[in-house]
Amino acid sequence: GSTVPPMVNVTCSEVSEGNITVTCRASSFYPRNITLTWRQDGVSLSHNTQQWGDVLPDGNGTYQTWVATRIRQGEEQRFTCYMEHSGNHGTHPVPSGNSHHHHHHHH
C-alpha cells in the first residue's frame, strides 16, 4: 500500500514529587517502520529513561505505537517528541499550560 503518515498526539499527566509523565502516540500510519523518541534540548533521551509500546495494527490496515518518559514539572519546554516515518520527520512539543493535548497530522 501507499504511505500513510502518522497522526502524532502528545499528552501529559501529573505524577508524584513534581514529575510529569509525557506520552507521545503515533497512530494511523503505514508502513509499520517508525522512529519515535523523546528529546531534551534536541538530544535524544537515553533508552533507559524511555518506555516504548509495541508497534501494533490498529484494525484499519495501519499501525500505532507510543513512547513515554518522566520529566520535571516546569521543564516541559525543553522536551519534544521526535518522529521519523518514510522519509518524513517532525518534532512535537509537550503541551504547555492547561492544554494537555497536542495533535499533528503529517503530510
Epitope: D41, V43, S46, T91
Partner: antibody, heavy 118, light 108 residues
Framework: EVQLVQSGAEVKKPGASVKVSCKAS????????IYWVRQAPGQGLEWIGY????????IYNQQFKDRVTITADTSTSTAYLELSSLRSEDTAVYYC???????????WGQGTLVTVSS | EIVLTQSPATLSLSPGERATLSCSAS???????LHWYQQKPGQAPRLLIY???NLASGIPARFSGSGSGTDFTLTISSLEPEDFAVYYC?????????FGQGTKVEIK
C-alpha cells in the same frame, strides 16, 4: 557531509546590532536544533540559546535574553543570531552548532569574529 | 546554574605521557549529560566524548572518559603531538547549558 557555514567577520560600534548567519547542509535542517555559543578572546565557551527549526521554539540563556534574537529560515536552511546594544564585552567568536543524537553539540560552524570597538 | 570546574588549568606533559583531566560539577549530573570537547587554536571545538564515556565518531581509542555524580575524568592514555589542545567539559542536564573553563594540555 554535515556542514555549518557561518557569515564573515564583523566590526561594530558600541550600541549597534549585528546579525550572524549559519547555513546548514548535508542533513535535514528541521530535524536538529541549532545552538549558538560564543567565546571571548582567550576565554571559555558560553551557551547563548538554541532554536528548533521545525516548530520554531527558541530557548535562551537568561543572561542574553534581553539582547539576543535567534531565528531560522527553513527555506534556505539558515539560522541567524542577532545581538543588539553591543558593548566591548561582546567581542567574541560566535559559533553555531547542531544538536546531536546523544550530545548537545555534535557539529560546529567555523565561527564568526564580532569585534565591538569605538 | 551548574558550575563546572576543570583542573588543572594547564597540564604540561611530553608526548607519550598519560594525561588526566578533571571536571567537577557544583551539583550532581546524570552521566548521560556530561560531554567533552577538544579545541585547537583558531578552530571550532569538536566533540570528543559524549555521555561521560562514549567516543565520538573518528576519535582514537587513546581517549577515554569516566565518572559519575559530580566528578568526571577525561584520560588520554598516551599523548600524541596532535592532542595538545584545550579540553572542555559540558553539561546538558539543566539550563543554562554550561561549559567548564577548560584545561590546556601543553607540551612540556
Amino acid at each position: 557531509e554535515v556542514q555549518l557555514v557561518q557569515s564573515g567577520a564583523e566590526v561594530k560600534k558600541p550600541g549597534a546590532s549585528v546579525k550572524v548567519s549559519c547555513k546548514a547542509s548535508g542533513y535535514a535542517f528541521t530535524s536538529n536544533n541549532i545552538y549558538w555559543v560564543r567565546q571571548a578572546p582567550g576565554q571559555g565557551l558560553e551557551w547563548i540559546g538554541y532554536i528548533d527549526p521545525y516548530i520554531g521554539r527558541i530557548i535562551y540563556n537568561q543572561q542574553f535574553k534581553d539582547r539576543v534574537t535567534i531565528t531560522a529560515d527553513t527555506s534556505t536552511s539558515t539560522a541567524y543570531l542577532e545581538l543588539s546594544s553591543l558593548r566591548s564585552e561582546d567581542t567574541a567568536v560566535y559559533y553555531c552548532s547542531r544538536s546531536g543524537e546523544r550530545s548537545n553539540f555534535d557539529y560546529w560552524g567555523q565561527g564568526t569574529l564580532v569585534t565591538v570597538s569605538s | 546554574e551548574i558550575v563546572l570546574t576543570q583542573s588543572p588549568a594547564t597540564l604540561s606533559l611530553s608526548p607519550g605521557e598519560r594525561a588526566t583531566l578533571s571536571c567537577s560539577a557544583s551539583s550532581s549530573i546524570s552521566s548521560n549529560y556530561l560531554h567533552w570537547y577538544q579545541q585547537k587554536p583558531g578552530q571550532a571545538p569538536r566533540l570528543l566524548i559524549y555521555r561521560t564515556s562514549n567516543l565520538a565518531s573518528g576519535i582514537p581509542a587513546r581517549f577515554s572518559g569516566s565518572g559519575s555524580g559530580t566528578d568526571f575524568t577525561l584520560t588520554i592514555s598516551s599523548l600524541e603531538p596532535e592532542d595538545f589542545a584545550v579540553y572542555y567539559c559540558q553539561q546538558g542536564g539543566s539550563l543554562p547549558l554550561t561549559f567548564g573553563q577548560g584545561t590546556k594540555v601543553e607540551i612540556k
